[in-house]
């Protein structure tokens, strides 16, 4: 919806030294980077699907919404958006689908108004622990970020470093306690097998947490107690088998929460009894009447809300002497 006011660079490509100097001087009022569209009225710059390999240096100082989607940025270095004067108005930055595989420490420094950051659909093999905090201090200056969108940032298996992807992401979220003000965190579609137990305790301002379309099997060691004002917890399309009493009690104790649990392979055996009882009583689960059993085979597609204790049995474990091969 933003209309281009100028899509020609103020500097010709035959004078690259000038282009690099532009970050140290005020951009011209009507300047718009090459291959971008700018609307001063909407405070918006769009450099979309242009195969850019680096962030344009000559971004207009008025920019509040910056779209750099569908490019080939590969690496986001420290101070990638640092300018003189700084981009003091930049509030929303979308870098999704730009083939980023490395985000370095301090990549988003000198953006004092940055509230929304979207790095989705980038194969982030190397996300610095200090990508968002900017420094390796044990307590960093608070980040202004309120929304952090990190959906589908898992790199292909063969491009992953020799470390836990979950651990790498969590280290970046927790470094320097910089993201204490974060209200929305989206981590959907990242093949997460587990959620490190310390991550939620250190993000007390979270209102919306999206963990959908991962591979979470259990929430046994995850505590939601600190997320006192959590409003939405998206756990659809995971590998959850059952929610245990501790988790159920914590969720019930959060007065503003809505929980989304569709499309999990619920195991309807004796361990499911507490969850079924809770589901029948609670109002916090959205679409709870759609939840169905996946296992055991005899229970497949049964609606959880329609089960009673007699339906939920566990086959007795035979002593070794009675087991057959």
């Amino acid at each position: 919806s933003s209309s281009p006011t100028s899509s020609a660079s103020s500097f010709s490509s035959s004078a690259p030294f000038l282009a690099s100097a532009v970050s140290a001087q005020p951009p011209l009022p009507d300047q718009c980077p090459a291959l971008c569209e700018c609307s001063e009225a909407a405070r918006t710059v769009k450099c979309v699907n242009r195969n850019l390999t680096e962030v344009p240096t000559d971004l207009p100082a008025y920019v509040r919404n910056l779209f750099l989607t569908g490019n080939q940025l590969a690496v986001l270095p420290a101070g990638a958006f640092a300018r003189r004067p700084p981009l003091a108005e930049l509030a929303a930055l979308n870098l999704s689908g730009s083939r980023l595989d490395e985000v370095r420490a301090g990549a988003f420094e000198h953006l004092p108004s940055l509230r929304q950051l979207d790095l989705s659909h980038n194969p982030l093999a190397d996300l610095s622990p200090f990508a968002f905090s900017g420094s390796n201090a044990s307590v960093s200056a608070p980040s202004p970020l309120v929304e952090l969108i990190l959906n589908h940032i898992v790199p292909p298996e063969d491009e992953r470093q020799n470390r836990s992807f979950e651990g790498m992401v969590v280290a970046a979220l927790l470094a320097g306690r910089a993201l204490q003000g974060l209200r929305r965190l989206e981590l959907a579609s990242n093949h997460f097998l587990y959620l490190p137990r310390d991550v939620l305790a250190q993000l007390p301002s979270l209102r919306h947490l999206d963990l959908s379309n991962n591979s979470l099997v259990s929430l046994t060691y995850v505590s939601f107690r600190n997320l006192t004002h959590l409003e939405s917890l998206h756990l659809e399309d995971n590998a959850l088998k059952v929610l245990h009493n501790g988790t159920l009690a914590e969720l019930q104790g959060l007065p503003h929460i809505r929980v989304f649990l569709d499309n999990n392979p619920w195991v309807c055996d004796c361990h499911m009894a507490d969850m079924v009882t809770w589901l029948k009583e609670t109002e916090v689960v959205q679409g709870k009447d759609r939840l169905t059993c996946a296992y055991p085979e005899k229970m497949r597609n049964r609606v959880l809300l329609e089960l009673n204790s007699a339906d939920l049995d566990c086959d007795p474990i035979l002593p070794p002497s009675l087991q057959t091969s």
Partner: antibody
Framework: QVQLVQSGAEVKKPGASVKVSCKAS????????MNWVRQAPGQGLEWMGR????????NYNGKFKGRVTMTADKSITTAYMELSRLRSDDTAVYYC????????WGQGTLVTVSS | DIQMTQSPSSLSASVGDRVTITCRAS??????LNWYQQKPGKAPKLLIY???RLHSGVPSRFSGSGSGTDYTFTISSLQPEDIATYFC?????????FGGGTKVEIK
């Protein structure tokens, strides 16, 4: 910052219904919960209910059950509160308040019920 | 419903004074206690949520404390612009309920 702008003052007869609207902007960081609170002249605050705008789930104060209906239109980021079978003691300023802890409030809509 | 009893109902203090308001819930509300400021003819504003967390943009002279059923709101140094009515509110157990309000005036 979240801004909430409510519809204008209304004068209604007893037995009639009133529908108040609340338009949210600065929406990106707003809450999914929209609460409705009323305040009779010179009195305190009374919570009427809330709606979760993403799925339309509502919680109502039992005092108003059967008389109040809360709805939301996500496409235009607007919430509505309709109160039916109005009585003279429903005369009050009606506020929408966004957030679990009622973080941001609209400017209020005066509803006067008088024959 | 949870009853919220606020005291005093009104108070008069000088600029620079420390002002304290208390709120008692009829049952444990697990720290889900908020404080609102309302100036005449205006909508309420959230100052403090979850007992002691300052809402964005609220001056640090406002603070809150407490647990269980007993909660306290403090203005460390009263300013002329703090003249208003202050309400406590519970958002732990539906329906949410409010205290009756404390009107703060300047001596």
């Amino acid at each position: 910052q979240v801004q909430l702008v409510q519809s204008g003052a209304e004068v209604k007869k007893p037995g009639a219904s009133v529908k108040v609207s609340c338009k949210a902007s600065g929406y990106a960081f707003s809450s999914s919960w929209m609460n409705w609170v009323r305040q009779a002249p010179g009195q305190g605050l009374e919570w009427m209910g809330r709606i979760y705008r993403e799925d339309g789930h509502t919680n109502y104060n039992g005092k108003f059950k059967g008389r109040v209906t809360m709805t939301a239109d996500k496409s235009i980021t607007t919430a509505y509160m309709e109160l039916s079978r109005l009585r003279s003691d429903d005369t009050a300023v009606y506020y929408c308040a966004n957030g679990g802890a009622m973080d941001y409030w609209g400017q209020g809509t005066l509803v006067t019920v008088s024959s | 419903d949870i009853q919220m009893t606020q005291s005093p109902s009104s108070l008069s203090a000088s600029v620079g004074d420390r002002v304290t308001i208390t709120c008692r819930a009829s049952q444990d509300i697990s720290n889900y206690l908020n404080w609102y400021q309302q100036k005449p003819g205006k909508a309420p504003k959230l100052l403090i949520y979850y007992t002691s967390r300052l809402h964005s943009g609220v001056p640090s002279r406002f603070s809150g404390s407490g647990s269980g059923t007993d909660y306290t709101f403090t203005i460390s140094s009263l300013q002329p612009e703090d003249i208003a009515t202050y309400f406590c509110g519970n958002d732990n157990t539906l329906p949410w309920t409010f205290g009756g309000g404390t009107k703060v005036e300047i001596k």
